[in-house]
């Protein structure tokens, strides 16, 4: 990596962090979705 | 996510030591960890760091006296090869790259015959 | 060697008052912008305040404030509280991939 050390920046993990909550979210909505059709 | 130091203790001048930081949350494979230490009633003083590739980089009065590696995918140790008196601190583990955005609640290694 | 210069070493200001603290770096950080600001009281582990010189981390209150680039930054904290009252840290990440810390300024809170 030609960046070093500064490829683990804070930027980067908040943006991995709520790339992360927004998939749970979804997936969330998306099984409750499944139960609640059986 | 976080990370937590364990392995401090009282050694006697010249024993070696290692410290574990042990990282929950995360896989190392993309975080950098630092290791940073604190002398009683002293301010905090940067050791060296390991990146995601395992390369390591300390700071200048670092080098020789500590190693840092990687050992499993959630663990990073720092060995103080020959501890002085002076090396007595809480050391602590942080992650990130060029700022320390997780850090440990440290642990205390004293250095003392 | 890089070096971090913090000054003042103590500050001491009344509740609701206002406190600045600066960091001068003996060579530019990291892209001019990596320096960060830490909180830590007695005790504890230092607390993650602002990254990249002016962005604050997550839950960290907007009367935190931090400004500069290259050598000179500055920590500005507005409408003290009790809780404010701590040591405070300046970092600076370096393009060879070398870290250090100021060496930290006491903040009274009256």
């Known amino acids: 990596h030609s960046d070093g050390i500064f490829t683990d920046s804070y930027s980067r993990y908040r943006k991995q962090m709520a790339v992360k909550k927004y998939l749970a979210a979804v997936l969330g909505k998306r099984y409750k979705q499944r139960v609640k059709n059986k | 996510q976080s990370v937590e130091e364990s392995g401090g203790r009282l050694v006697t001048p010249g024993t070696p030591l290692t410290l574990t930081c042990t990282v929950s949350?995360?896989?190392?494979?993309?975080?950098?960890m630092n290791w940073v230490r604190q002398a009683p009633g002293k301010g905090l003083e940067w050791i060296g760091i390991i990146d995601n590739t395992a390369g390591t980089y300390y700071a200048p009065w670092a080098k020789g006296r500590f190693t840092i590696s990687k050992t499993s995918s959630t663990t990073v140790d720092l060995k103080m090869t020959s501890p002085t008196t002076e090396d007595t601190a809480t050391y602590f583990c942080?992650?990130?790259?060029?700022?320390?955005?997780?850090w440990g609640p440290g642990t205390l290694v004293t250095v003392s015959s | 060697a890089q070096v971090l210069t913090q000054t003042p070493s103590s500050v001491s200001a009344a509740v609701g008052g206002t406190v600045t603290i600066n960091c001068q770096s003996s060579q530019s950080v990291h892209d001019g912008s990596y320096l960060s600001w830490y909180q830590q009281k007695p005790g504890q582990p230092p607390n993650f305040l602002i990254y990249q010189a002016s962005n604050l981390a997550s839950g960290v209150p907007s009367r935190f404030k931090g400004s500069g680039s290259g050598t000179q930054f500055t920590l500005t904290i507005s409408d003290l509280e009790c809780d404010d009252a701590a040591t405070y840290y300046c970092?600076?990440?370096?393009?060879?991939?070398?870290?250090?810390f100021g060496g930290g300024t006491e903040v009274v809170v009256k």
């Open positions: 970092a600076g990440g370096y393009s060879s991939n070398i870290c250090g």
């Open positions: 949350g995360f896989s190392l494979s993309s975080a950098a």
């Open positions: 942080a992650r990130g790259g060029g700022e320390f955005f997780i």
